[in-house]
């Protein structure tokens, strides 16, 4: 018997593009470039679980979904990998799973999701607020992530049978309507930049929670739903962080772990830290205030309980390292 | 040892929908996904799609995009494949099967396979 | 999509014989390949999974071996009731089949 997370309404970002662009009529060019550029983005899905028969378990499930061979999966808590995050664990396709308690058990559970299983009291207990991220690095996508966390009402006794998440996909009807939709979007959006191309470029703020500036895109809405994919990294409860997570799990302690850096557990710094070359920008985001915006992918964002979905707010990253290249 | 035991034989007329279930026993059904593959009569082997039950999340093949619904029901342990639009090429024997795994590194396997459910598509 | 091509399509050997089959993928796929034997109106059974790794209760006759894009099933001594169609499956990107090879008695 468990208790799933439930995913708050899904609102798109509030502040209009308008203020970036300065330009009102600039505006619908800009979304349909969007809906151009961002078809078939790949997404991530989390579900967090915590377990009736263990208070103090959790079960975190995520996967991807897109058409990239996968290269490495972090799991962290307490935001996104990188932003802040702790990371949980790290599992590599091939070389093996690293996990930093309280996670007692990560593992591939299918060939594109993994799961973990989270415990513990005391100081590094998770708690009903705890937000949880996962993040997949794929090639030749890059990098996506997504959060997800229990509300803080979640009652463990409940008898409630877990409700099944909405399968994701696009019927025959949506694809034509988007295909519909993009081609005349891009078709009108040339125009529209032929005509004013004696305007000034409008200037997108690279989003500060990334060393890169990457390419703009902005929130694009699905046909399938007024939601957008995007909620904003939930504030945690600071109390329910593990005080330390020096104690490393590997399984079979393959060699390729002798590389992670010494406090990966508490400055988790993603699969660039193993990388011997450069990572390219590849960016996905408008950042308007430092504000994290997703952008709508190709697939309806049918979310439900214990699902969110939304991709990296710092844009995919090749894997060109080691651990990227099979 | 799961056993997957999968609904008889059917036959359609072109246009129509087809719904096939497959029932697992003797394991673990809801974190393991279940794969859906067909074989039309003296031809290959074609994977349509996936679901993992206890998250309910389906993968499809691009081919069948918008023609193919898997769904899959926890407390009955039972999957299902849904295929619309029916035409005579859709004649063949549909497969389920466990998408299994040691759970340390991402290889996966089908094993076990259902016995295979006939749809015969005819006007 | 990762295609996967397999040769031969079909051939006749003898019990005894040494049969290799060879499966390429349009793309790296690493080691994530995995090799079915199926007979006529049977379910496919799993021979080797992760390109090399024998299945438990396969007999040690059956090999698989290569990475990458090539790949290779090796009966070493042609048994009677080895005679069925072999495919090989990706499962790096979803999953894609091989077209299959037919191994039929010369």
């Known amino acids: 018997m468990r208790t799933e997370a439930q995913v708050p309404a899904l609102q798109p970002p509030e502040p209009g593009l308008e203020g970036a662009m300065g330009h009102r009529t600039l505006v619908l060019p800009w979304v349909l470039l969007t809906l151009c550029v961002t078809a078939g983005t790949p997404e991530v899905w989390v579900q967090v679980r915590m377990e009736a028969t263990e208070l103090s378990s959790f079960t975190i499930r995520c996967g991807f979904l897109g058409s990239g061979s996968i290269s490495l999966v972090t799991v962290s808590w307490g935001g996104p990998n990188g932003a802040g995050g702790t990371t949980l664990a790290v599992l590599h396709p091939e070389r093996g799973i690293r996990q930093w308690a309280p996670a007692r058990q990560a593992r591939w559970e299918t060939q594109s999701s993994i799961s973990l299983i989270l415990e513990g009291s005391g100081a590094s207990s998770p708690c009903a607020n705890t937000t949880f991220c996962c993040k997949f690095a794929s090639f030749p996508e890059g990098s996506w992530e997504a959060c997800g966390s229990l509300p803080p009402s979640s009652d463990p006794g409940l008898s409630a049978p877990p409700t099944p998440a909405p399968i994701l996909r696009a019927d025959l009807a949506g694809i034509l309507g988007v295909s519909g939709v993009l081609l005349f979007g891009c078709v009108y959006l040339l125009h529209l930049l032929r005509r004013h191309k004696h305007r000034p470029a409008p200037r997108l703020q690279p989003s500060r929670t990334s060393p890169q500036a990457p390419r703009a895109r902005a929130w694009a809405p699905s046909q399938a739903s007024q939601a957008a994919l995007h909620v904003p990294y939930a504030t945690i409860n600071t109390s329910c962080r593990p005080a330390t997570l020096d104690t490393a799990h590997p399984h079979g302690g393959p060699s390729w772990w002798a590389s992670l850096p010494t406090h990966a557990a508490h400055r988790p710094q993603g699969p660039a830290a193993w990388a011997s070359t450069p990572i390219p920008a590849r960016g996905s985001f408008v950042s308007v205030e430092n504000g994290l915006y997703a952008q709508a992918g190709e697939r309806p964002p049918h979310t439900g309980p214990g699902l969110t979905l939304f991709p990296d707010p710092r844009g995919p990253r090749a894997m060109e390292g080691p651990l990227g290249v099979r | 040892q799961v056993q997957l035991v999968q609904s008889g034989a059917e036959v359609k007329k072109p246009g129509s929908s087809v719904k096939v279930s497959c029932k697992a026993s003797?394991?673990?059904?809801?974190?393991?996904?279940i794969s859906w593959v067909r074989q039309a009569p003296g031809q290959g082997l074609e994977w349509m799609g996936n679901i993992i039950p206890i998250v309910g999340i389906a993968n499809y093949a691009q081919k069948f995009q918008g023609r193919v619904t898997i769904t899959a029901d926890e407390s009955t342990s039972t999957a299902y494949m849904e295929l619309s639009s029916l035409r005579s090429e859709d004649t063949a024997v549909y497969y389920c099967?466990?998408?299994?795994?040691?759970?340390?590194?991402?290889?996966?396997?089908?094993?076990?396979w259902g016995q295979g459910t006939l749809v015969t598509v005819s006007s | 999509d990762i295609q996967m091509t397999q040769s031969p399509s079909s051939l006749s050997a003898s019990v005894g014989d040494r049969v290799t089959i060879t499966c390429r993928a349009s793309q790296s796929i690493s080691s994530y390949l995995n090799w079915y034997q199926q007979k006529p109106g049977k379910a496919p059974k799993l021979l080797i999974y992760?390109?090399?790794s024998l299945q438990s209760g396969v007999p040690s006759r059956f090999s698989g071996s290569g990475s990458g894009t090539d790949f290779t099933l090796t009966i070493s001594s042609l048994q009677p009731e080895d005679f069925a169609t072999y495919y090989c499956?990706?499962?790096?990107?979803?999953?894609?089949f091989g077209g299959g090879t037919k191994v039929e008695i010369k």
């Open positions: 499956q990706q499962s790096d990107i979803l999953y894609t």
């Open positions: 003797g394991g673990t059904f809801s974190s393991a996904a």
């Open positions: 992760a390109a090399s």
């Open positions: 099967a466990r998408d299994t795994g040691r759970g340390y590194t991402r290889h996966f396997w089908f094993d076990p």
